[in-house]
């Protein structure tokens, strides 16, 4: 139930994929990751106005109840719908190894 | 990677399951749902402080980058980790039918 992809708040204001550049130091990884030295972190950022990219029925309910009880029920939130794997070269006790993380980089976003 | 379940903000302030009572009118369902007349909607509400119920590596990264760039990167968000199905009695062209929705009621929460 991926509802409307038209953002009523103006271009780029609603939930979408953004790329944030981060160093190993920024991420707190400098002591266990060798490479890459800099990571292009893709993440989901932006507002979730009524029915925009609603992930499911729960998101639609949340929108309705947020409208009625904004102090109790928060608006839906922009989160990853899927991920791209990322490969890191990690330090190990015996040297280095490649490690793949499936849940590190957002690939697609929705509101929930 | 479901990190700490201890809420540093005080009891009940962090991401957890809440129940919100809603009528069919509240949900905008009165024209297509016969029963139940009132729904106990379980949803995920609360703050996601550093590493609290972090769903995965992405959530951990988000926490680190939010600390560094709070105006650019939002904090992780409290969303369902899983759902409970819910059965509705719906109006149809020919009468009524039972319909099960798998993604309506939050069962468990995490931060992402």
């Amino acid at each position: 139930a991926r509802n409307g992809d038209h953002c009523p708040l103006g271009p780029g204001r609603c939930c979408r994929l953004h790329t944030v550049r981060a160093s190993l130091e920024d991420l707190g990884w400098a002591d266990w990751v060798l490479s890459p030295r800099e990571v292009q972190v893709t993440m989901c950022i932006g507002a979730c106005p009524s029915q925009f990219r609603a992930a499911n029925m729960h998101a639609q309910i949340k929108t309705s109840l947020h409208r009625l009880k904004p102090d109790t029920v928060p608006a839906p939130c922009c989160v990853p719908a899927s991920y791209n794997p990322m490969v890191l070269i990690q330090k190990t006790d015996t040297g280095v190894s490649l490690q793949t993380y499936d849940d590190l980089l957002a690939k697609d976003c929705h509101c929930i | 990677a479901r990190n700490g379940d201890h809420c540093p903000l005080g009891p009940g302030r962090c991401c957890r399951l809440h129940t919100v009572r809603a009528s069919l009118e509240d949900l905008g369902w009165a024209d297509w749902v016969l029963s139940p007349r009132e729904v106990q909607v379980t949803m995920c509400i609360g703050a996601c402080p550093s590493q609290f119920r972090a769903a995965n590596m992405h959530a951990q990264i988000k926490t680190s980058l939010h600390r560094l760039k709070p105006d650019t990167v939002p904090a992780p968000c409290c969303v369902p980790a899983s759902y409970n199905p819910m059965v509705l009695i719906q109006k149809t062209d020919t009468g009524v039918s039972l319909q099960t929705y798998d993604d309506l009621l939050a069962k468990d929460c995490h931060c992402i």
Partner: nanobody, 121 residues
Framework: QLQLVESGGGLVQPGGSLRLSCVAS????????IGWFRQAPGKGLEGVSC????????YYADSVKGRFTISRDNAKNTAYLQMNSLKPEDTAIYYC??????????????WGQGTQVTVSS
């Protein structure tokens, strides 16, 4: 355009060997790091090995260390993955990819179409 083509896959018995090749066209391979990925049935992509462009440093996933060897022949614009002591869990589609440095990522600039490796008795 930039293109990579893998070959050398097939059906092999447990304990057997295969050598996969990755031929580049449209660009010179020696300017790039080469990575091998695999995708087992119902699983996500996994980085298996990588060889850097500069000093030819090599990197391996723990699951293949000591059994797989990555190499390159810049004169032939080709990279290789020698796979020995194959196990049923190595069954997957194997892809090569090229990028500026190791570790090569899923979002890299050039990506092959894959070659199937099946390890079964």
């Amino acid at each position: 355009q930039l293109q990579l083509v893998e070959s050398g896959g097939g059906l092999v018995q447990p304990g057997g060997s295969l050598r996969l090749s990755c031929v580049a066209s449209g660009f010179t391979l020696d300017d790039y790091a080469i990575g091998w990925f695999r995708q087992a049935p119902g699983k996500g992509l996994e980085g298996v090995s990588c060889i850097s462009s500069s000093d030819e440093s090599t990197y391996y996933a723990d699951s293949v260390k000591g059994r797989f060897t990555i190499s390159r022949d810049n004169a032939k614009n080709t990279a290789y993955l020698q796979m020995n002591s194959l196990k049923p869990e190595d069954t997957a589609i194997y892809y090569c990819a090229a990028d500026t440095e190791c570790p090569v990522q899923v979002t890299s600039m050039a990506w092959g179409q894959g070659t199937q490796v099946t390890v079964s008795s």
